[in-house]
């Protein structure tokens, strides 16, 4: 960075090179150039010369003042106009940063996705800090009192093999950067209570032409958990409101769920499951689209989930998960 240049003087910041966003700051430049009594001292921010709020303090030093500095990062350098020198002479440079101390991490959540071999812990970090902020996840066994710490920039995956202190743990998160530190409340967990079953997936749909046409949704999961509760939500793509059906499920075979839907309407389906009686749900599955026929029976399979809005196809639509605002994983 700019801090690696050879200096003929010094540049510094009051209050400091890392400071809270919105502060008033002063940047000082002090020349120490051989055979040069600077006629003028210039400041540059990100390569652009500053024109205002510059005060000459003495023969070798000048000050640049910023009110309410809001840039997360800036490269500052200063130069001198020396007599008999055609070009400005570089004095020194410094990278400055502004941001915020971290908020108290909240909504600490730890789950074990079946087959992952990891405990995944996440939290709400709060407002953006703009500066390098690290998180230390503390995991303390309630049985052995042993504590482990994991350093991360966001979430953390902790191998379940490393959790040797029994089943009960306290988990908390410490956030820290150069402007401060905060600590979350402690979350008490039992490893058996935080397992989320292997993802449930909708594979296909068919509408059977009967007196009252019915649509069958086929869905499955690779879970080995015996008692699983699931929810399937569905709506017409033109609607805002979801309808939800609940199921107690045994995944020894593919699930078939029946729905009586309006003809000639495009519907969207999603499913999610949890171990019965436990706290955390899977995130909702990818969107699965199915258009009910006017009269003719119709099958929609996952393999044919294309985007009708883009492709102009009349049947199936996309099953990617980014089209719904509440598809971010309701595990709370």
């Amino acid at each position: 960075g700019i801090t690696n240049i050879n200096c003929s003087g010094h540049i510094w910041v009051e209050p400091a090179t890392i400071f809270k966003m919105g502060m008033n700051i002063s940047i000082y430049c002090q020349a120490a150039i051989k055979n040069c009594q600077p006629r003028k001292l210039h400041f540059y921010k990100n390569g652009i010369k500053e024109r205002f709020q510059i005060t000459r303090i003495n023969k070798t030093t000048a000050r640049l003042w910023y009110k309410n500095f809001l840039e997360p990062h800036a490269s500052m350098y200063c130069t001198a106009e020396c007599p008999k020198h055609f070009q400005e002479t570089l004095i020194c440079g410094k990278d400055i940063s502004s941001g915020y101390p971290p908020d108290i991490p909240d909504e600490v959540t730890c789950v074990i996705y079946e087959y992952s071999g990891n405990m995944t812990c996440t939290w709400n970090a709060g407002k953006l800090t703009y500066i390098d902020t690290k998180y230390v996840v503390h995991v303390k066994s309630l049985e052995t009192e042993e504590e482990q710490q994991y350093l991360t920039s966001s979430y953390i995956n902790i191998s379940t093999d490393s959790l040797q202190g029994g089943k009960k743990y306290l988990v908390w998160v410490q956030a820290a950067n150069a402007l401060g530190m905060e600590e979350s409340k402690q979350l008490q967990i039992h490893l058996d209570d935080i397992v989320i079953p292997s993802a449930a997936v909708i594979s296909r749909a068919e509408t059977i032409n009967a007196t009252v046409p019915k649509t069958i949704i086929y869905w499955d999961s690779q879970t080995t958990i015996e008692k699983v509760s699931c929810e399937m939500r569905y709506k017409a793509t033109t609607n805002q409101t979801w309808n939800v059906k609940e199921f107690d499920t045994n995944f020894t075979y593919v699930q078939q769920s029946e729905f009586y839907l309006e003809p000639n309407i495009k519907y969207v389906f999603q499913v999610r499951c949890q171990e019965t009686g436990k706290r955390y749900w899977q995130p909702w599955s990818s969107l699965f689209f199915h258009k009910t026929p006017e009269t003719v029976p119709q099958v929609t399979s996952k393999a044919f989930q294309h985007d009708t809005w883009n492709s102009g196809l009349t049947v199936a639509s996309i099953s990617t998960g980014h089209l719904t605002s509440d598809n971010r994983g309701d595990i709370g």
């Epitope: 010094h10 510094w12 910041v13 009051e14 809270k20 000082y28 390098d132 150069a178």
Partner: antibody, heavy 119, light 108 residues
Framework: EFQLQQSGPELVKPGASVKMSCKAS????????MHWVKQSHGKTIEWIGY????????SYNQKFKGKATLTVDKSSSTAYMELRSLTSEDSAVYTC????????????WGQGTTVTVSS | DIVLTQSPAIMSASLGERVTMTCTAS???????LHWYQQKPGSSPKLWIY???NLASGVPARFSGSGSGTSYSLTISSMEAEDAATYYC?????????FGSGTKLEMK
């Protein structure tokens, strides 16, 4: 000449509180962070926290939250630290230090205030 | 917390001897935010080397500092009697700001 003058030694009983001061002179008090550290006999230096006099913003070491409270009086260019619920573990030398500016470091230190907690 | 481990804890050197002490951080620290302080008995610490390699005002040129990432060092090219003191490394890369446990340098 820059100077940080701290209040005198304190002998206090367990469970009591103590408030020490650090008077700054020779520079613009509000332009620099004021940090506080603890040094127990034969032990390393522990950072307690800082205060920015201009805004009153504070940041604490988690270990000292609830133990230390930092304040300033801008009119007298004085920083204060109050320690509460004192125990023998709190017996130490507590020092204020100016931070920032030219060195971007704790460049000027007070002489320290010795706190002895004893019944 | 970033733990700074200094070694050796105690060392002694003869007049004119070259001295090197190290400071190892438990996680990476920006060289701009790694400083060294000198402390003598009965006194408060004094800023000695700032931003890894820059000498504070009044510090003799026989002192130097270097390092990056997790490994830093302070070197005295030729030991003098007045250099006998405890030297602490310090990081303010990330809160809580921490100090090393110190290297006590004695005169042989």
């Amino acid at each position: 000449e820059f100077q940080l003058q701290q209040s005198g030694p304190e002998l206090v009983k367990p469970g009591a509180s103590v408030k020490m001061s650090c008077k700054a002179s020779g520079y613009t008090f509000t332009n620099y962070y004021m940090h506080w550290v603890k040094q127990s006999h034969g032990k390393t230096i522990e950072w307690i926290g800082y205060i920015y006099p201009n805004s009153g913003d504070t940041s604490y070491n988690q270990k000292f939250k609830g133990k230390a409270t930092l304040t300033v009086d801008k009119s007298s260019s004085t920083a204060y630290m109050e320690l509460r619920s004192l125990t023998s573990e709190d017996s130490a030398v507590y020092t204020c230090a100016r931070f920032g500016g030219f060195y971007d470091a704790m460049d000027y230190w007070g002489q320290g205030t010795t706190v002895t907690v004893s019944s | 917390d970033i733990v700074l481990t200094q070694s050796p804890a105690i060392m002694s050197a003869s007049l004119g001897e070259r001295v090197t002490m190290t400071c190892t951080a438990s996680s990476s620290v920006s060289s701009s935010y790694l400083h060294w302080y000198q402390q003598k008995p009965g006194s408060s610490p004094k800023l000695w080397i700032y931003s890894t390699s820059n000498l504070a005002s009044g510090v003799p040129a026989r002192f130097s500092g270097s390092g990056s990432g997790t490994s830093y060092s302070l070197t005295i090219s030729s030991m003098e009697a007045e250099d006998a003191a405890t030297y602490y490394c310090h990081q303010y890369h990330r809160s809580p700001f921490t100090f090393g446990s110190g290297t006590k340098l004695e005169m042989k």
